[in-house]
């Protein structure tokens, strides 16, 4: 990527944050070994990465969770990467699903999502999970980011 | 990315190598369908990718392993992507965890890690696992790489 | 990346398509929130991404599947990212393996593959799985793409 003002690097990597909120949208923070290249990408409300420039972005998320088959609903643990664009329908871009473990008290599993998508100016991406209380927030386990091609 | 001398592409993809060493750091080789773009990234001592230029890098690793719950410790299998920079603390950048399988003799599982990080000149990244003897080294199962944005 | 004619962005992201074919090669479609940057990368026969320009590419695939240990063969579910280049041997670039779940009727699991590879002009990449009937085709679960560095 060129480093000139015309075409600056745009990249972000944010770190999961435990939250008392009951929402299924994961919370993130600019803490630890995070990346925020410039103000052309921002973390808004601790939950979504919002971009100012239209273009192709590689967007990724990693979620580690700990769950047990007996203590969880029958449905698998699902992580979804979602897109909100001004004036457009909200979209699911990527999803991954893992059946709960039989390990006691819970079994850890990690999910990785990633793909190339066209984002509009002002578009926001965020991560949804079926049960945020099962997400692992230890160093490096759960993160979210993007880079502009 | 521009291909001029000013801003050459920097990328690497190396292939896992079985090792008799008892260390938890995985060993890699420039073999098979590997990538080493130029000498601005090098594989050092078969275990770490070292970069010469400061900048944002997308770094990734994939580890496939085969383990059994009864034969393994109670702790899950954890793969960690770690960073060593001159003059700085060693850091865990990313981790993923998978509980051992109940399949016999062992159950295979794959972990993928990836994220965007700022690297200093001379920084090295490497991959740690809880039990290297469980790692699968068949073609394509376990690999490690990076690309400079 | 420069946006001039000299060095246009090349990227693709395609969406899984259920198929009645018995082949182990997964089928893809330009549907939903797909990406096809230009004609320098194309989806051929619904099964392979073919590039016109030589260079380094980050190639990735995500496969979600639902399987049961009793109903499946003893071998794990394996997803392979493969390369076909004119005049060269077909290569396995990346593989991931997950042992089947004991959940009934089946347990969902997701696999992510990704790496940097040198592709020749006319090279094609495709995704193989051990049992395509187990693949999940719900929105966002299974996808395949690449981006040129």
């Amino acid at each position: 990527m060129q480093k000139g003002d015309q075409n600056p690097q745009i990249a972000a990597h944010v770190i999961s944050e435990a939250s008392s909120k009951t929402t299924s949208v994961l919370q993130w923070a600019e803490k630890g070994y995070y990346t925020m290249s410039n103000n052309l990408v921002t973390l808004e409300n601790g939950k979504q990465l919002t971009v100012k420039r239209q273009g192709l972005y590689y967007i990724y998320a990693q979620v580690t969770f700990c769950s047990n088959r007996e203590a969880s609903s029958q449905a698998p643990f699902i992580a979804s990467l979602c897109l909100k664009s001004p004036g457009r329908f909200e979209r699911i871009l990527l999803r991954a699903a893992n059946t709960h473990s039989s390990a006691k008290p819970c079994g850890q599993q990690s999910i990785h999502l990633g793909g190339v998508f066209e984002l509009q100016p002002g578009a926001s991406v965020f991560v949804n999970v079926t049960d945020p209380s099962q997400v692992s927030h230890g160093t490096g386990f759960t993160s979210f980011g993007l880079l502009k091609l | 990315m521009q291909k001029g001398d000013q801003n050459p592409q920097i990328a690497a993809h190396v292939i896992s190598e079985a090792s008799s060493k008892t260390t938890s750091v995985l060993q890699w080789a420039e073999k098979g369908y590997y990538t080493m773009s130029n000498n601005l990234v090098t594989l050092e001592n078969g275990k770490q990718l070292t970069v010469k230029r400061q900048g944002l890098y997308y770094i990734y690793a994939q580890v496939t392993f085969c383990s059994n719950r009864e034969a393994s410790s109670q702790a899950p299998f954890i793969a960690s992507l770690c960073l060593k920079s001159p003059g700085r603390f060693e850091r865990i950048l990313l981790r993923a965890a998978n509980t051992h399988s109940s399949a016999k003799p062992c159950g295979q599982q794959s972990i993928h890690l990836g994220g965007v990080f700022e690297l200093q000149p001379g920084a090295s990244v490497f991959v740690n696992v809880t039990d290297p003897s469980q790692v699968s080294h068949g073609t394509g199962f376990t690999s490690f790489g990076l690309l400079k944005l | 990346m420069q946006k001039g004619d000299q060095n246009p962005q090349i990227a693709a992201h395609v969406i899984s398509e259920a198929s009645s074919k018995t082949t182990s090669v997964l089928q893809w479609a330009e549907k939903g929130y797909y990406t096809m940057s230009n004609n320098l990368v194309t989806l051929e026969n619904g099964k392979q991404l073919t590039v016109k320009r030589q260079g380094l590419y980050y190639i990735y695939a995500q496969v979600t599947f639902c399987s049961n240990r009793e109903a499946s063969s003893q071998a794990p579910f394996i997803a392979s990212l493969c390369l076909k280049s004119p005049g060269r041997f077909e290569r396995i670039l990346l593989r991931a393996a997950n042992t089947h779940s004991s959940a009934k009727p089946c347990g969902q699991q997701s696999i992510h593959l990704g790496g940097v590879f040198e592709l020749q002009p006319g090279a094609s990449v495709f995704v193989n799985v051990t049992d395509p009937s187990q693949v999940s085709h719900g929105t966002g679960f299974t996808s395949f793409g690449l981006l040129k560095l």
Epitope: G32 | E44, Q48, V51, K52, K84, P86, G87, E90, R91 | -
Partner: antibody, heavy 119, light 111 residues
């Protein structure tokens, strides 16, 4: 126990060359960045060079670039500093140093070897 | 390059009292939640000895009377209570970025 022992110092005329060595023991040599640091007669400390564990990365301050070359022999656990086009301001005690495991700061130092550049 | 300015250049402190040495950096040495400032002690005829790493962490084997604090550009080394054996020259050093630089040193004399 970590040990670093420098050798190769001595007197040399301006424009001359000298090769310093540092024998390392008590740790896995190839796992560590290694450094040279010098101390001038006025007791000022100056970083001289760094080399990565495998030797692929090296760096120097601008005033020493092109004149000094750091290298290592991981098979023999030896660190080298080749110095050429020496100037009187290069007169100093030269120390071989190493950081602690995974932590910043030069935790291990040799006893030093004295280099005197004088006509 | 990051310049480090130490003050005072020398000080004399009575046995059992507190010695305070300051180090100012020409730019911040903070990164990812850590401050990359280290402190050393050097006695005549010996190499420097690491006392404190990353602004406030006591190196193994160093007595607890040594402490340090600071972030960004302003850092302080404290010795309390000062003992006879603490007579030495003290240096700060930044390991935030290459070229690694040292302060000019502070000579501590015990009264």
């Amino acid at each position: 126990e970590v040990q670093l022992v420098e050798s190769g110092g001595g007197s040399v005329k301006p424009g001359g060359s000298l090769k310093l060595s540092c024998a390392a023991s008590g740790f896995t040599f190839s796992d560590h960045y290694m450094y040279w640091v010098r101390q001038t007669p006025e007791k000022r400390l100056e970083w001289v060079a760094i080399i990565s564990g495998g030797g692929s990365y090296t760096s120097y301050p601008d005033s020493m670039k092109g004149r000094f070359t750091i290298s290592r022999d991981n098979a023999k656990n030896i660190l080298h500093l080749q110095m050429s086009s020496l100037k009187s301001e290069d007169t100093a005690m030269y120390y071989c140093t190493r950081e602690s495991n995974g932590k910043p700061g030069f935790a291990y130092w040799g006893q030093g070897t004295l280099v005197t550049v004088s006509a | 390059d990051i310049e480090l300015t130490q003050s005072p250049t020398s000080l004399a402190v009575s046995l059992g009292q507190r010695a305070t040495i300051s180090c100012k950096a020409s730019q911040s040495v903070d990164y990812a939640g850590d401050s990359y400032m280290n402190w050393y002690q050097q006695k005549p005829g010996q190499p420097p000895k690491l006392l404190i790493y990353a602004a406030s962490n006591l190196e193994s084997g160093i007595p607890a009377r040594f402490s340090a604090s600071g972030s960004g550009t302003d850092f302080t080394l404290n010795i309390h209570p000062v003992e006879e054996e603490d007579a030495a020259t003290y240096y700060c050093q930044q390991s935030y970025e290459d070229p690694w630089t040292f302060g000019g040193g502070t000579k501590l004399e015990i009264k």
